[in-house]
């Protein structure tokens, strides 16, 4: 259908770079969560930083193009990078409105499928773009 995709938009303080121009921020009448209407794709993304005790959202928004994973109805994150020892960045892509608001499931740190702790390390901020 020709309707444009609408996603949750969030960028944690201190994150370098922005995906704000990949869509049009909407006035939804509430301060949070913010919504963004995608310009160049029908695909939302989310990035969460999983540490031993909690998962913290880093970024949510629109992707710049449709690609594998965007056909998913729900946000099913996959491990992508290690910003620091003991933490893992998980990302998802999905193709329904607000599908990136939350993830369906995150594997526990160190479980099979999670990159080993000896994996590549990235400087804070750089790791977000590695994950994208």
């Amino acid at each position: 259908p020709p309707n444009r995709r609408t996603c949750v938009f969030f960028e944690a303080p201190g994150v370098r770079g922005s995906t704000k121009t990949l869509g049009e921020l909407l006035d939804t009448g509430t301060e949070l969560p913010r919504a963004i209407r995608c310009l160049y794709s029908r695909c939302c993304f989310g990035i969460w930083n999983l540490t031993q005790d909690r998962a913290q959202v880093e970024m949510q928004g629109c992707r710049d193009s449709d690609e594998p994973g965007c056909e998913s109805l729900h946000c099913d994150p996959s491990p992508r990078a290690h910003p620091s020892p003991g933490s893992t960045l998980f990302t998802c892509s999905c193709g329904t409105d607000f599908c990136n608001a939350n993830y369906s499931h995150l594997p526990p740190p160190g479980s099979p499928g999670t990159p080993g702790s000896q994996g590549p390390q990235a400087a804070p901020g750089e790791s977000i773009w590695m994950a994208l």
């Epitope: 309707n3 909407l26 710049d64 193009s65």
Partner: antibody
């Protein structure tokens, strides 16, 4: 100051391919936003044809999808339009324009392309 | 495709008068209460010029006598006091759905 300038043949024969280039100065086409082609038949309204985004994503008007190709040359900061199998109905002023989000804030001056044998 | 119908086709006003131009969409151009309708002015031999975006936001450098309003399917461009330089053709454009579409235009002429 951002400027866009269309160039290409002003006369194209029926059934041939119309080719136009838009040269952008004052802004990199790989920095942000989308780069569009819009046309206007003489004395008529405007028709959005398609865009190529800063990242290379492409979107076409379905009414033209089988005939249109938009591409870019990032080294020259240019983007181009090809429209195949043209007829007299494709006679128009062709504009290139930048879309800031989903509206058009910078336009070229336009170039008239006439389809005639 | 969303069809935009502008009325009247031609509007005759005297300088200093108020001008009201309408644009009606075949279906809503709103997303979660946000209207994706934009207005342009075009003079002979020139490209269109952006006046209003997202129904009511005035583009930088455009005189405040121009204003936009409306939601869903019905939108209005108002020129509070028409000046000589305002006589031109005005187009609305929607971007709520692909493909982007334009209205047929309203010609504002001197009465």
């Amino acid at each position: 100051q951002l400027q866009l300038q269309e160039s290409g043949p002003g006369l194209v024969k029926p059934s041939e391919t119309l080719s136009l280039t838009c040269t952008v100065s004052g802004y990199s086409i790989t920095s942000d936003y989308a780069w569009n082609w819009i046309r206007q038949p003489p004395g008529k309204g405007l028709e959005w044809m398609g865009y190529i985004s800063y990242s290379g994503s492409i979107s076409y008007n379905p009414s033209l999808k089988s005939r249109i190709t938009i591409s870019r040359d990032t080294s020259k900061n240019q983007f181009s339009l090809k429209l195949s199998s043209v007829t007299a109905a494709d006679t128009a002023v062709y504009y290139c324009a930048r879309s800031r989000y989903s509206w058009f804030d910078y336009w070229g001056q336009g170039t008239l392309v006439t389809v005639s044998s | 495709d969303i069809v935009l119908t502008q009325s009247p086709g031609t509007l005759s006003v005297s300088p200093g008068e108020r001008a009201t131009l309408s644009c009606s969409a075949s279906e809503s151009v709103d997303t979660y209460g946000n209207s994706f309708m934009h207005w342009y002015q075009q003079k002979p031999g020139q490209p269109p010029k952006l006046l209003i975006y997202r129904a009511s936001s005035l583009e930088s450098g455009i005189p405040v006598r121009f204003s936009g309003s409306g939601s869903r399917t019905d939108f209005t461009l108002t020129i509070s006091r028409v000046e000589a330089e305002d006589f031109a053709v005005y187009y609305c454009q929607q971007s709520n759905e692909d493909p982007y579409t334009f209205g047929g235009g309203t010609k504002l002429e001197i009465k």
